[in-house]
Structure formats: structure tokens, C-alpha cells
């Protein structure tokens, strides 16, 4: 039916308006409707104005794409022409009164199907239903994949590329891992994969600046030292260094009037040129203070070295030795002295004898036939030496002796001088003044080392060699190395140390072969004003130990291979050091930081005497240990 | 340095005494022997003697045993040398001279500047 | 008493050396005599040069040396300077006192 009243419509249009020209009253009758009359009547004036005569040409040259007055007049009602609709998106035009309807392809909407449907972006259907990649495209979309994936047949799903099986040579030597959409070329820690060499280089940390003081780089990491010598130890973030702090603080006060006579490990501490007119005799009287067994405390010679008088201390007690054209004698006597009191010694050379007095009791009398020192040409010339003598005296001496000796003078007088000569040298020069308080016990001021030749074979034994150690320790600082055994390769095969602990306000022991810890006894309280005992042993099959809390024998499965190392070091040659390392790499052991404060040393049975050492660090005090700092009211 | 500062010219009469000062500087006093010498007008140099400031011990030449004291005071670092009886033959420029080593007697190293006495009725 | 003596005096040119010396009535000089070398300067500046026999006085420049030459006491000027012109004048020791020679007049011309 709808068909139909189209044609009648199109039958009168052609009536009234084609084969004669219809005003818009007669375009009304046609239409029966405004809105369709008024849609068709100005565009039928148009068609009129083109197809007029005399405007033929002009029309066909128009944008008028119609031959005729006719073709141009039906066409107007055709709402479907010219296509009102987006071409690429429509899929049909259907003409209405006076408007069109486009139906969409599916992909397009819109009046004209103008617009892309983005179905990436569909609420009701997230990323298109792709599982990786939504690609809209103009009426559609497709799904695709990252690099490192393939799609399924299913067009929306994506499945991970197992690199590492399709190319198993792609990381060459690293090992190679996959991950979802990629694969990495995995090093060990330490190192770092090299592209164009296909291989796991190592890191050098070092050269980024990891560490604050030292660093050792080796393949696969890095290690941070501190330099121990210089005071410092390794925080707890194994870079930094900090300062190694004192834990039990000493009173270091020293007074000039104090002459401190181990100044020097090997020589004289001081040397005196007497020429005097008046004086025919030698004089000597002072105040005398030591711990020390033995040792010298003054030698006076002659100018041409003919005549000398040592006098000395062995076995605690004073010993007088003298040489000259008349005589040549030595005495001991008197009581032990080496009390760490003050003792009142005076030695003066009277006509016929030598008189020696402590606290002005005469505690010896020795007989010479002539004066000691003979004056020439009225004067008196003298060099006095205090704690040592010349080299050349050594093979002179009536009974050799240890010239060392820790001890300090006070109140001399020499030669009835007063203390002219002496006071002048020494005020100056603070390595000569003694401290003000000791206590016995050897101190290890944290600046040097001592070192011995300690013979650790025991033939009778069969385990060949053993080190037993009793150690009386009273540290200051809470790091140091306390022994060590050094070997010819600059390694060190033994070493027990004191170390700060993670605990506050307490001390680790570490025992280390080389550069391994084997035990750490932790937290002890080192840092008190009490002595603290250790004993261990070791031979090339045990490790024991002992320490104020505990008493035990150490095994674990490295032990074994680690005193084999100890062993092998000790068929060689090893040197002891106390109080420290000498220089040896800072990575040839855990600690190498000096120890400071007190401490005794036992090794096989044999109290060690710093004295006897073959070589020391000037400041270390072989028989004299600083009293630990009382704070006073005012302090 | 070193510095001997002696006290101002004197004139005397005879048979007065005079007391000339010789204050040091620049070093320990008491570790360093202090001699007095003499120089009369156009004469050479005639030793008086020494003084160990530290012990306070003299020695005084012959020729002027008895007539000369020497003395020190260790708190102001100074020797003196008085001389009696004084006699018109003792005019002559007096001068201390120190050791120039300490507690080494003989080495007559540092000189004062020198103290006119003059000896006339 | 000891007497000591001296050359009177000696002329030298700068830059030359010149030695000075010092006898002793007694007999040789030695090193237990101790001798002194002691330089007088206009207005009595004296300043000493040389102790036992060889001891340079400190400050004293090293052209100036002691030794004993035969049986004397000497002092030699090695490279004399016009400001080395003075009355030099020696002292030696005897067991208990001090004899100063006469003194010798140096003229650096």
C-alpha cells in the first residue's frame, strides 16, 4: 500500500511541477504534508533556476549533477539522494518525509553512520575481550600481542614466548631466564651481564666508590676494609669506617719532672756531658720508680771510655758494676725495689768506696783502691747515660744484662747538679715524661706491636707443634688484634682479636685462620677496671678455650680444614706479634686494628717480657700499665 | 738568645768595695758556669774566677783570694761580683762570660757587655 | 803563673787564610789545656769563638776552627772577612784557673 500511494505521489509531482511549473499551493496538494512541501519547494526552485533556458550550459558545468529539469525535480523527495550517509559505515539508506535513515554496518553509529564504534573501550566488553592489545580500526577492531608473546587461535588470547628453549644459545654464558613476554641473561651476584660479549663480567665495586676507606674487589664482590693502624674499624653497614672508640678510658698524665726511661725500645733515653772543675767524685741520688725486673737505669764513663760505672737492676734488686785501671767489680743488694713505689736511690763515690743507699739506709759498700773517674787537669769529665749504655759496652759489662727497663726518675741530682741538664732535655719532649700513675701489667698504647721468636715444636709431642695462651687482658678500646702469627708469606695463619660486639657495652673474642673467623666467643664485658683471663690451645687437631664464662672444646666441619691450613703454617715459620699486625694486607685477617690497653701474655709456660722482644713499638710499656680514669667531682 | 746584661759603670775610692751584677737571659742559669774577667786600661784580659750558679760553689784565682766574692740569685738569674779593698791598679773594665755548654766547665762561649770600675781618690 | 803568648799581630788579605796562634810558657799545649779563642771587637765587644781547643762557640761561622799545631794552640781563619778584623785574644786552662795570652791585633787589608 505504501508502495502505491509513492507512485500516485510521483505521478502528480510529474504533473503539476514537471510538465508545469507548480507554485508552493500546488506542491502542498502533491504532498499532502508542510514538512515534505517544505523540504521539496526551495530545492524545486533551485532545479527551475538551473534548467531555465539559457542556463543549460551553466547547469551541466554546475554541481548540478542532473541532465533535466525532470531527473533534478524527482530527485528532490529522494531524501537518499545524494547519500546522505558515511559511505565506509552504512550499510543502507532508507528515504523518509522530508529525512533519511542510515543503517549501520556493526562497528558504526551514528545519524549518518559517521562514527567509529572504539569497542576497545566497551564497558560490557573490557579491552575488546583481548587479553593484551586492543586495536580499534575504523568499523572494527583486532586483538595483538606484546613482543615476547604469539596469539592464539582464538584471535584474543596471548601465550608467552619461551625464549630461553627456541635460542638456548641467546645468553651465551649467563643463564638464561624467562619471563613472561621477555627472558634476562641472569648473573651470579657480583656480576654483570656484557651484551656484546655474551658473558657475566665481574663488578668492580671498587671502582664505584662503595667503600669509605679501603676496598678489595674479587670476582663476585667486594670487600670494605677500615684502617685499623690509623684507629678505625668497620661499621655495621660493612662501607663506612668509624673511629674506634675507647671503652674504658685510662689516665694518660704525664708530668715533665718525670724522666721516663723506656722511651726508646733499643738505645739511650738520655745522654749527659759532665766537665766540672770543682767535683773529683761521681754523685748520683734520684727517685726511682719501676715494675721492671731488670734493666739499666744509669751507665757513667770516662771521657776515653777507660772507667765506667753501670748501675742496673736484676731480679728487682740493685746491681752495681764498675771497671778502671785499679778494679773492676760488680754487687747486688739491697731490697727488691721493683715495687712500682717510689724508692730514694743514691750512689756517691767517697774517698775509699762506693756507697749505695735506698730511702738513705746504706744498702751496699764497695771498696776501690782509687777514685773512679781520674780528673784531668783539674776537671772532671763524664758522659752519663740513662737506661742503656753505648753499643760497644755490651761485650765490656762484668755480667751482661737486659739494658731495658720501664721505670721512671724523679728529683735527680747528678753530680751535684741539681737538675740542671736533665730538666732542660726533657721538658720539651713529652715522649719523656713519665706517667703520673702505673699499675703493674704491660700497656699497648693501640699505635705499635711487639714481636717474638716463640719455637712452637714439641718434638716429645705427637701432635708436633702447640700454642697455649693465657692472655690477662684489660682493653681500653673495644677492637685489636691482641696475637697473631705471622707467616713468612705475609699471611697470618692465627689470630685472636677483640672486637666491638652488636650488643652494647660488650666485647666479640674472634679466633681466625687467615682471613676466616673460626670462633667468636660473644658478648664478654672486656671493658671493665678487672683483668679479664682467656686461655685456649690449639694444635692441629683441637681448638679449646676458655674464658671467664666458659670452658669448651670447639668443633664444626670447617674446623678441621681450617687448622690444616694452621698446621701447614706452622711446619713453616712463624713470627708472634703482639698488640697488632705488622704490615700484612688489610684483607689477611677479619680485625687489624692495634690493641689498646693492658695486657699479659703467657705462651708454652713462658711469661712473655716485652723486654725480651726483638723488636717494639717505642710506646708500648713493657712493665707499667695506666691506671684507669677516675672521674674525680670536678672531672 | 743568650744575653749577659751587666749593671753601669762605678767609680770608687780606694779601699771601697764595689758590687757589679751580671743578669742572664736566654737560657737555664743555674746549668751554666759564670766567669769574671778583667781588662785594665791598655792591658790584656786577666781571669777572675768562676761560680756555679746551681751550687753556688766558687774558685777564685790566687791573686784574688780573699778580696773577691762572687754570688748569684738563682730566682733573678743573676751572679755578682764584689770586689774590697779596692786599689787604684783594680780600674779596669770588669765582664762576666758564661759557659756556652751546660754542666761542660771551659767554654767561655757568651760575654756581657762589660762594668767601667773606676778606682780613684 | 803560667805566661801565654800570642804574635802580637798579623796582617792578611780577604779571602785568605790566616792562623793564629797560642804558646804556653809551661810547656806544649794538649787538649787538657781546654784553650779558648775569644774575639774583642771595638767598644769591648767580646765574643767567644772557640772552647776546648776545637769546640766552635754556637753562631760562630765555620771559617773560623781551633786545633793544636805542634805545641800550640791555633786558631785559623780560612777565608778571612773584612769583619773578621779584631783583637783575638786565647785562654788556657791550668788545673785551676784560666791564663789569658796577650792577644793578637788581626788587620784585614
Known amino acids: 500500500a505504501n508502495s502505491l500511494l509513492e507512485e500516485t505521489k510521483q505521478g502528480n509531482l510529474e504533473r503539476e511541477c514537471i510538465e508545469e511549473l507548480c507554485n508552493k499551493e500546488e506542491a502542498r496538494e502533491v504532498f499532502e504534508n508542510d514538512p515534505e512541501t517544505d523540504y521539496f519547494y526551495p530545492k524545486y526552485l533551485v532545479c527551475l533556476r538551473s534548467f531555465q533556458t539559457g542556463l543549460f550550459t551553466a547547469a551541466r558545468q554546475s554541481t548540478n549533477a542532473y541532465p533535466d529539469l525532470r531527473s533534478c525535480v524527482n530527485a528532490i523527495p529522494d531524501q537518499c539522494s545524494p547519500l546522505p550517509c558515511n559511505e565506509d559505515g552504512y550499510m543502507s539508506c532508507k528515504d523518509g518525509k522530508a529525512s533519511f535513515t542510515c543503517t549501520c554496518k556493526p562497528g558504526w553509529q551514528g545519524e549518518k553512520c559517521e562514527f567509529d564504534i572504539n569497542e576497545c573501550k566497551d564497558p560490557s566488553n573490557i579491552n575488546g575481550g583481548c587479553s593484551q592489545i586492543c586495536d580499534n580500526t575504523p568499523g572494527s577492531y583486532h586483538c595483538s600481542c606484546k613482543n615476547g608473546f604469539v596469539m592464539l587461535s582464538n584471535k584474543k588470547d596471548c601465550k608467552d614466548v619461551d625464549e630461553c628453549s627456541l635460542k638456548p644459545s641467546i645468553c651465551g654464558t649467563a643463564v638464561c631466564k624467562n619471563i613472561p613476554g621477555d627472558f634476562e641473561c641472569e648473573c651470579p651476584e657480583g656480576y654483570r651481564y656484557n651484551l656484546k660479549s655474551k658473558s657475566c663480567e665481574d663488578i668492580d665495586e671498587c671502582s664505584e666508590n662503595m667503600c669509605a676507606q679501603l676496598c678489595v674487589n674479587y670476582p663476585g664482590g667486594y670487600t670494605c676494609y677500615c684502617d685499623g693502624k690509623k684507629g678505625f674499624k668497620l661499621a655495621q653497614d660493612q662501607k663506612s669506617c668509624e673511629v674506634v672508640s675507647v671503652c674504658l678510658p685510662l689516665n694518660l698524665d704525664t708530668k715533665y719532672e718525670l724522666l721516663y726511661l723506656a722511651e726508646q725500645f733499643a738505645g739511650v733515653v738520655l745522654y749527659l756531658k759532665f766537665r766540672l772543675p770543682e767535683i773529683s767524685r761521681f754523685s748520683a741520688e734520684f727517685d726511682f720508680r719501676t715494675y721492671d725486673s731488670e734493666g739499666v737505669i744509669l751507665y757513667a764513663e770516662s771521657i776515653d771510655h777507660s772507667a765506667w760505672l753501670l748501675i742496673a737492676l736484676r731480679g728487682g734488686k740493685i746491681e752495681v758494676q764498675l771497671k778502671n785501671e785499679h778494679t773492676s767489680k760488680i754487687t747486688t743488694g739491697g731490697d727488691v725495689i721493683n715495687n712500682g713505689l717510689w724508692n730514694m736511690v743514691s750512689v756517691e763515690e767517697l774517698e775509699h768506696s762506693i756507697s749505695i743507699k735506698i730511702a738513705k739506709e746504706a744498702v751496699m759498700d764497695i771498696n776501690k783502691p782509687g777514685p773512679l773517674f781520674k780528673p784531668e787537669n783539674g776537671l772532671l769529665e763524664t758522659k752519663v747515660y740513662f737506661a742503656g749504655f753505648p753499643r760497644k759496652v755490651e761485650s765490656e759489662l762484668i755480667k751482661p744484662i737486659n739494658p731495658r727497663l720501664d721505670g721512671c726518675i724523679r728529683s735527680w741530682n747528678l753530680m751535684k747538679q741539681g737538675a740542671s741538664g736533665i730538666k732542660e732535655i726533657i721538658q720539651e719532649k713529652q715522649n719523656k715524661h713519665c706517667l703520673v700513675t702505673v699499675e703493674k701489667g704491660s700497656y699497648y698504647p693501640g699505635s705499635g706491636i711487639a714481636q717474638f721468636h716463640i719455637d712452637y715444636n714439641n718434638v716429645s709431642s705427637a701432635e708436633g707443634w702447640h700454642v697455649n695462651v693465657t692472655l690477662n687482658i684489660r682493653p681500653s678500646t673495644g677492637t685489636g688484634v691482641m696475637l697473631a702469627l705471622v707467616s713468612g708469606n705475609n699471611t697470618v695463619p692465627f689470630a685472636v682479636s677483640l672486637v666491638d660486639s652488636t650488643s652494647e657495652k660488650s666485647q666479640d673474642i674472634l679466633l681466625s685462620v687467615e682471613n676466616t673467623v673460626i670462633y667468636r666467643i660473644q658478648a664478654l664485658s672486656l671493658c671493665s677496671d678487672q683483668q679479664s683471663h682467656l686461655e685456649f690451645r690449639v694444635n692441629r687437631n683441637n681448638l679449646e678455650l676458655s674464658t671467664p664464662l666458659k670452658i669448651e672444646t670447639i668443633s664444626h666441619e670447617d674446623l678441621q680444614r681450617q687448622l690444616a691450613v694452621l698446621d701447614k703454617a706452622m711446619k713453616a715459620k712463624v713470627a708472634t706479634y703482639l698488640g697488632g699486625l705488622p704490615d700484612v694486607p688489610f684483607s689477611a685477617t677479619p680485625v687489624n686494628a692495634f690493641y689498646n690497653g693492658c695486657m699479659e701474655v703467657n705462651i708454652n709456660g713462658v711469661q712473655l717480657d716485652l723486654d725480651e722482644a726483638i723488636s717494639k713499638h717505642n710506646d708500648i710499656r713493657a712493665h707499667s700499665c695506666p691506671s684507669v680514669w677516675k672521674k674525680t667531682k670536678n672531672s | 738568645q743568650v744575653q749577659l746584661v751587666q749593671s753601669g759603670a762605678e767609680v770608687k775610692k780606694p779601699g771601697a768595695s764595689v758590687k757589679v751584677s751580671c743578669k742572664s737571659s736566654g737560657h737555664t742559669f743555674t746549668g751554666y758556669y759564670m766567669h769574671w774577667v778583667r781588662q785594665a786600661p791598655g792591658q790584656g784580659l786577666e781571669w777572675m774566677g768562676w761560680i756555679n750558679p746551681n751550687s753556688g760553689d766558687t774558685n777564685y784565682a790566687q791573686k784574688f783570694q780573699g778580696r773577691v766574692t762572687m754570688t748569684r740569685d738563682t730566682s733573678i738569674s743573676t751572679a755578682y761580683m764584689e770586689m774590697s779593698r779596692l786599689r787604684s791598679d783594680d780600674t779596669a773594665v770588669y765582664y762576666c762570660?758564661?759557659?756556652?755548654?751546660?754542666?761542660?766547665?771551659?767554654?767561655?762561649?757568651?760575654w756581657g757587655q762589660g762594668t767601667l770600675v773606676t778606682v780613684s781618690s | 803563673q803560667a805566661v801565654v803568648t800570642q804574635e802580637s799581630a798579623l796582617t792578611t788579605s780577604p779571602g785568605e787564610t790566616v792562623t793564629l796562634t797560642c804558646r804556653s810558657s809551661t810547656g806544649a799545649v794538649t787538649a787538657s789545656n781546654y784553650a779558648n779563642w775569644v774575639q774583642e771587637k771595638p767598644d769591648h765587644l767580646f765574643t767567644g769563638l772557640i772552647g776546648s781547643t776545637n769546640n766552635r762557640a754556637p753562631g760562630v761561622p765555620a771559617r773560623f776552627s781551633g786545633s793544636l799545631i805542634g805545641d800550640k794552640a791555633a786558631l785559623t781563619i780560612t777565608g778571612a772577612q773584612t769583619e773578621d778584623e779584631a783583637i783575638y785574644f786565647c785562654?788556657?786552662?791550668?788545673?785551676?784557673?784560666?791564663?789569658f795570652g796577650g792577644g793578637t791585633k788581626l788587620t784585614v787589608l
Open positions: 785562654a788556657l786552662w791550668y788545673s785551676d784557673h784560666f791564663v
Open positions: 762570660a758564661r759557659d756556652s755548654q751546660i754542666l761542660w766547665f771551659g767554654e767561655l762561649g757568651y
